[in-house]
């Protein structure tokens, strides 16, 4: 005959454990029911009565099957640099993540404890590693033949436009300015940028070599977080 199903509370067989969604109550020395997520144990079990569960109050939660006497408090409201990506309910805690343009400088078990603004690369410097949810932007100087004239946490250095006749040579913080004859872009079409303050880095203030002698310059790879460098700026 099949073994009879035991109903909680019941005394476990020696050496055996309680079943799924049950716990062993040391005082009653019985296997008793756990409370479902969103509830907590209002009255613990005895040898003759099972656990009495009650719903979590507002702003409290339990995420797992449990026998805790009180529900856990939801975390405080998200700060102004955060967005609430998961609301506080009886079954889950509030989760705050950093809003766009910020990254998590100090994480916690779920969500973020401290957000910080993504570093902005100043003119003459470009993004060499895009920011992520958990890492800051890295800025590096624009290589010869490239420029960035923005203060931005997303802009990479871009190649100077190629002019038939150069009016003003480009530098690290300014695109080349062509005379009225139409330029050939070395990049996707875009507006001609007006002169900006010249970078203090002498290596980038020299006229760019003609294409025939320019070094084969290429890729764009990003890197890990770094402390604020001279190429970065605060908000």
């Amino acid at each position: 005959l099949p073994a009879q199903v035991a109903f909680t509370p019941y005394a476990p067989e020696p050496g055996s454990t309680c079943r799924l969604r049950e716990y062993y109550d040391q005082t009653a020395q019985m296997c008793c029911s756990k409370c479902s997520p969103g509830q907590h144990a209002k009255v613990f079990c005895t040898k003759t009565s099972d656990t009495v569960c009650d719903s979590c109050e507002d702003s409290t939660y339990t995420q797992l099957w449990n026998w805790v006497p009180e529900c856990l408090s939801c975390g405080s409201r998200c700060s102004s640099d955060q967005v609430e990506t998961q609301a506080c309910t009886r079954e889950q805690n509030r989760i705050c993540t950093c809003r766009p343009g910020w990254y998590c400088a100090l994480s916690k078990q779920e969500g973020c404890r401290l957000c910080a603004p993504l570093r902005k690369c100043r003119p003459g410097f470009g993004v060499a590693r895009p920011g992520t949810e958990t890492s800051d932007v890295v800025c590096k100087p624009c290589a010869p033949g490239t420029f960035s004239n923005t203060t931005s946490s997303t802009d990479i250095c871009r190649p100077h436009q190629i002019c038939n006749v150069v009016a003003i040579p480009g530098n690290a913080s300014m695109d080349a300015v062509c005379t009225s004859t139409s330029p050939t872009r070395s990049m996707a079409p875009g507006a001609v940028h007006l002169p900006q303050p010249v970078s203090t880095r002498s290596q980038h203030t020299q006229p760019t070599p003609e294409p025939s002698t320019a070094p084969s310059t290429s890729f764009l790879l990003p890197m890990g977080p770094s402390p604020p460098a001279e190429g970065s700026t605060g908000d």
């Epitope: 895009p130 590096k140 100087p141 990479i156 290429s218 790879l221 890197m223």
Partner: antibody
Framework: EVQLVQSGAEVKKPGATVKISCKVS????????IHWVQQAPGKGLEWMGR????????EYAPNFQDRVTITADTSTDTAYMELSSLRSEDTAVYYC???????????WGQGTTVTVSS | QAVVTQEPSLTVSPGGTVTLTCRSS?????????ANWVQQKPGQAFRGLIG???DRAPGVPARFSGSLLGGKAALTLSGAQPEDEAEYYC?????????FGGGTKLTVL
């Protein structure tokens, strides 16, 4: 003139470790990342990782992260790539480079041949 | 890690147009992958041609152009020259690392 000069060829036994150097000149080493790329015989390129010489921060390809260590010494303008637990599939030419999909500062070392054989 | 796939080989006639593509195993290629294209000629140094999906590197001839086509990165060579015969590699950025494709051997014939 920008130059990246790598150390010479190496022959190693399986399980050993190899450390290759890459001496840069002609630019400020902290201005650009240094990358390491593998090219096995008859095969394509495999990006291994990179170092920011300014602060030593590194990023590695998932396929290599357990075995590779990339460092940079700004006092000697030299970057290093150490690959451990060598196996025969690691027989390849290894290149250091300033190629960085974000900067157009594109220079490559001459390559270092590593042969792993018992 | 992600796998980046390219055509193993392509052939183009001198003066003709050819498009090389670069597919990501993780989904459509976007501008956040900062697609790069690198050229390797036998016995010569590598040369970066395209960065940031569609920016030609300084000194790269206008016949090379980069774009996104149907969820893939693409390198189009318009008016192929004999000296363009080479191996072409694409590289895609994935949050904190680069992945190269297997390369396309381009023959100008």
């Amino acid at each position: 003139e920008v130059q990246l000069v790598q150390s010479g060829a190496e022959v190693k036994k399986p399980g050993a470790t190899v450390k290759i150097s890459c001496k840069v000149s002609g630019y400020t080493i902290t201005d650009f990342y240094i990358h390491w790329v593998q090219q096995a015989p008859g095969k394509g390129l495999e990006w291994m990782g990179r170092v920011d010489p300014e602060d030593g921060n590194t990023e590695y390809a998932p396929n290599f992260q357990d075995r590779v260590t990339i460092t940079a010494d700004t006092s000697t303008d030299t970057a290093y790539m150490e690959l451990s637990s060598l196996r025969s599939e690691d027989t390849a030419v290894y290149y250091c480079s300033t190629w960085d999909g974000f900067s157009y500062f594109d220079y490559w070392g001459q390559g270092t041949t590593v042969t792993v054989s018992s | 890690q992600a796998v980046v796939t390219q055509e193993p080989s392509l052939t183009v006639s001198p003066g003709g147009t050819v498009t090389l593509t670069c597919r990501s195993s993780t989904g459509p290629v976007t501008t956040n992958n900062y697609a790069n294209w690198v050229q390797q000629k036998p016995g010569q140094a590598f040369r970066g041609l395209i960065g940031g999906t569609n920016d030609r590197a300084p000194g790269v001839p206008a016949r090379f152009s980069g774009s996104l086509l149907g969820g893939k990165a693409a390198l189009t060579l318009s008016g192929a020259q004999p000296e363009d015969e080479a191996e072409y590699y694409c590289a895609l950025w994935y949050r904190n690392h680069w992945v190269f494709g297997g390369g396309t051997k381009l023959t100008v014939l």
